[in-house]
C-alpha cells in the first residue's frame, strides 16, 4: 500500500469518516505510520 504522507492522510480521513470520528486523540497523520492501516 502507498505510504507517502499524502496517502496516509487520505486513508486516515477515510477511517475517521467511517468511524464517525470516534478514535483516539493522537490518531492524526503525523503520529500514524502506514503500518497502522
Amino acid at each position: 500500500a502507498c505510504d507517502t504522507a499524502t496517502c496516509v492522510t487520505h486513508r486516515l480521513a477515510g477511517l475517521l469518516s467511517r468511524s464517525g470520528g470516534v478514535v483516539k486523540n493522537n490518531f492524526v497523520p503525523t503520529n500514524v505510520g502506514s503500518k497502522a492501516f
Epitope: 507517502t4 499524502t6 496517502c7 475517521l16 497523520p29 503525523t30 503520529n31
Partner: antibody, heavy 119, light 107 residues
Framework: EVQLVQSGAEVKKPGASVKVSCKAS????????MNWVRQAPGQCLEWIGD????????NYNQKFKGRATLTVDKSASTAYMELSSLRSEDTAVYYC????????????WGQGTTVTVSS | DIQMTQSPSSLSASVGDRVTITCKAS??????VAWFQQKPGKAPKSLIY???YRYSGVPSRFSGSGSGTDFTLTISSLQPEDFATYYC?????????FGCGTKVEIK
C-alpha cells in the same frame, strides 16, 4: 478558519540563500504534514518536499536535496523552506500546502511567495 | 521519478460544453492522483483527491476517474469561472510529480 500565510517577496543574488516562512492557523499545526511546491514562470509545478511538524522528519525531491532545507517552529506554528546556492532558474513562486482533516477536510495552500534571483 | 503527461496542453471551449482532460502516469500509481485548478496569479485550488473524490465545496460538475496509469478530469458543463489551467498530480511515490497543465480557454 484555516489559513497558511506566507512571507513576502524576495530578491536575491545568485549564490545567496532564501528562507520562506508559512504561518499556519485555524488547525493543529503538528497534526498534518506540510508540503512545499514551486512554480517557475511558464513552467510545471514542482514538489520540493514535505515535513512532519510533529517529529521534524522530512522527504525531499532529490532534485533539491542538499540545497533545500525544511524546518518548523512548533511554538509559532510556522514552517520554513530555505533554499541555498540560488541560481536564476530558482526564480519562481514558492507555495506551502497542507491537507487538513479537522476542522475541514481540504487541501489548503498558502498565497505563494515570489523569489527572484537576479544579479 | 514518475512522469505525469497531460493532454491536451490547451483547449478552447464554450460555456456549457463538456470538457475532458486526461493524464497518463509513466507507471502504476493506483488511484493516488489529485487534480487542481489554477487561475493567473493565484495559488492552485484542490478539486479532486484519490482520483475520483471531490473535496467539500467543489461543484458537482467536476468529476475524476481512472486508476493505474490513465486518469480523467471531466467538467460536465463548463461555467465562466472554470476558465483556468488544470493540473494532475500523483502522490503514490516520492517525489510527488505534476502534469504540466491544461489551459482551458474561451472559444
Amino acid at each position: 478558519e484555516v489559513q497558511l500565510v506566507q512571507s513576502g517577496a524576495e530578491v536575491k543574488k545568485p549564490g545567496a540563500s532564501v528562507k520562506v516562512s508559512c504561518k499556519a492557523s485555524g488547525y493543529t499545526f503538528t497534526d498534518y504534514y506540510m508540503n512545499w511546491v514551486r512554480q517557475a514562470p511558464g513552467q510545471c509545478l514542482e514538489w520540493i518536499g514535505d515535513i512532519n511538524p510533529n517529529q521534524g522528519g522530512t522527504n525531499y525531491n532529490q532534485k533539491f536535496k542538499g540545497r533545500a532545507t525544511l524546518t518548523v517552529d512548533k511554538s509559532a506554528s510556522t514552517a520554513y523552506m530555505e533554499l541555498s546556492s540560488l541560481r536564476s532558474e530558482d526564480t519562481a513562486v514558492y507555495y506551502c500546502a497542507s491537507i487538513i482533516i479537522v476542522p475541514n477536510y481540504f487541501d489548503y495552500w498558502g498565497q505563494g511567495t515570489t523569489v527572484t534571483v537576479s544579479s | 521519478d514518475i512522469q505525469m503527461t497531460q493532454s491536451p496542453s490547451s483547449l478552447s471551449a464554450s460555456v456549457g460544453d463538456r470538457v475532458t482532460i486526461t493524464c497518463k502516469a509513466s507507471q502504476n500509481v493506483d488511484t493516488n492522483v489529485a487534480w487542481f485548478q489554477q487561475k493567473p496569479g493565484k495559488a492552485p485550488k484542490s478539486l479532486i483527491y484519490s482520483a475520483s473524490y471531490r473535496y467539500s465545496g467543489v461543484p458537482s460538475r467536476f468529476s475524476g476517474s481512472g486508476s493505474g496509469t490513465d486518469f480523467t478530469l471531466t467538467i460536465s458543463s463548463l461555467q465562466p469561472e472554470d476558465f483556468a489551467t488544470y493540473y494532475c498530480q500523483q502522490y503514490n511515490n516520492y517525489p510527488y510529480t505534476f502534469g504540466c497543465g491544461t489551459k482551458v480557454e474561451i472559444k
